[in-house]
C-alpha cells in the first residue's frame, strides 16, 4: 500500500490521543534503554510502511501483535485516514489474527513494540519538520 495520500495530521492526532498510550502500556515494566532502535524511516509514508509491517507482519519470535489493542487502533486509524487502505490491507491481516495462539508477551515482542514506538516518534518528527 502507498501511504502517500494519507491525512498525516489526523493520524498524528490519533496516535497522540490513544495509540501511544496503548504502546506504552504494553511496554510497562521495561526501560527505554532496554532495547536499541534498529529500524528507522525517512519520511511520513515510509514511516507508516514500516509501522504497518512491524505491527501486522508476523516474525519468527513474535508471531503476531495484530490482536493487541494498539494494533487494532492502528488499523482503524489507517482505515480512516488512508483512502484505499482497508481494501488492500485489512483482509491480508485477518489471517495473522488466527496465527496467534496465546497471549504471551515475549521479550522479542517487547523489542518489536519498542521499535514501533521509535518509528511513531520519527513519524511525528518528520511531520513537525514539514510544518
Amino acid at each position: 500500500y502507498d501511504f502517500t495520500n494519507c491525512d498525516f495530521q489526523k493520524i498524528e492526532a490519533d496516535y497522540l490521543r490513544t495509540i501511544s498510550k496503548d504502546l506504552i502500556t504494553y511496554m510497562s515494566g521495561t526501560k527505554s534503554t532496554d532495547f536499541n532502535n534498529t529500524v528507522s524511516c525517512s519520511n511520513r509514508p515510509h514511516c507508516l510502511t514500516e509501522i504497518q509491517s512491524l505491527t501486522f507482519n508476523p516474525t519468527p519470535r513474535c508471531a503476531s501483535l495484530a490482536k493487541e489493542m494498539f494494533a487494532r487502533k492502528t488499523k482503524a486509524t489507517l482505515a480512516l485516514w488512508c483512502p484505499g487502505y482497508s481494501e488492500t490491507q485489512i483482509n491480508a491481516t485477518q489471517a495473522m489474527k488466527k496465527a496467534r495462539k496465546s497471549k504471551v508477551t515475549t521479550n522479542k515482542c517487547l523489542e518489536q513494540v519498542s521499535q514501533l514506538l521509535g518509528l511513531w516518534r520519527r513519524f511525528i518528527r518528520t511531520l513537525l519538520k514539514k510544518q
Partner: antibody, heavy 120, light 111 residues
Framework: QVQLVQSGAEVKKPGSSVKVSCKAS????????INWVRQAPGQGLEWLGV????????IYAEKFQGRVTITADTSTSTAYMELSSLRSEDTAVYYC?????????????WGQGTLVTVSS | QSALTQPPSASGSPGQSVTISCSGS?????????VSWYQQHPGKAPKLMIY???KRPSGVPDRFSGSKSGNTASLTVSGLQAEDEADYYC???????????FGGGTKLTVL
Amino acid sequence: QVQLVQSGAEVKKPGSSVKVSCKASGFTFGSYGINWVRQAPGQGLEWLGVIVPLVGVTIYAEKFQGRVTITADTSTSTAYMELSSLRSEDTAVYYCARGQEYFYWYFDLWGQGTLVTVSS
Amino acid sequence: QSALTQPPSASGSPGQSVTISCSGSSSDIGGYNRVSWYQQHPGKAPKLMIYDVSKRPSGVPDRFSGSKSGNTASLTVSGLQAEDEADYYCSSYAGTDTFILFGGGTKLTVL
C-alpha cells in the same frame, strides 16, 4: 441478536436541542463506525456524521459542523447524537447506522429511526 | 460538496431490467471504489443492497448488481419483481473530510 435500537420520538421547540440514543447489541460496538443519517418528510437521506469509538474519532458533515455532537459510551454500547439550535427544517427521522469494522463507509445495519419534530 | 445526482424516478414491468444512475465527481465516485446502494420501502429503514461498487451482502438477490464507469455509478435490477418497488439511494465515500455523500434518491416503480 445483532441490532441497533433507538430512543423514542421527540417534539422540540425551535432553538432547543435534542439528544437521540442508539443502543447496539450482538456485536463488538467499539470497532465499528456508528453513523447518523436523517431523512426529512418526503426527502432523501442526509449524512450527519460518524463516531468510531475504538479510536475516539468523530467526523461531521460540513453542513452540521458546530451544531451536531456525536458521542459514544462503550460501557453501555450506546451512541448519542445531539443536535442544537433546532429549526423547523430539522424535522426528520434520524437513523443510526453501523459502518462496517474498518470499512466505515457502508452501512450494513440500521436502527429503526427516531422521529424528531421541531415545532413552536 | 453537494449530493450525488440520481434521476428522481425509474420504472419497468415485471421481469424487465432497469438501471439507475448516480453521478458524482472525481472527488467521490470517480476517486474511490466505495459506492453503496440502499433500498428503502415506505416507513422502513434503508437496507444495504450493494457495497464497494459491485459487492452484494448475503441475503440480497443476485438480480441486483452494481457497476461504475468514471464518475458515474449504476445499479441494475434485472427480472423486476413487485417487491422491488421502493426508493433507491446511492452513497459514496468522498475523502477524509467530507467522508460520505448520498444521492437524492430514485423512486423505482414496477408497472
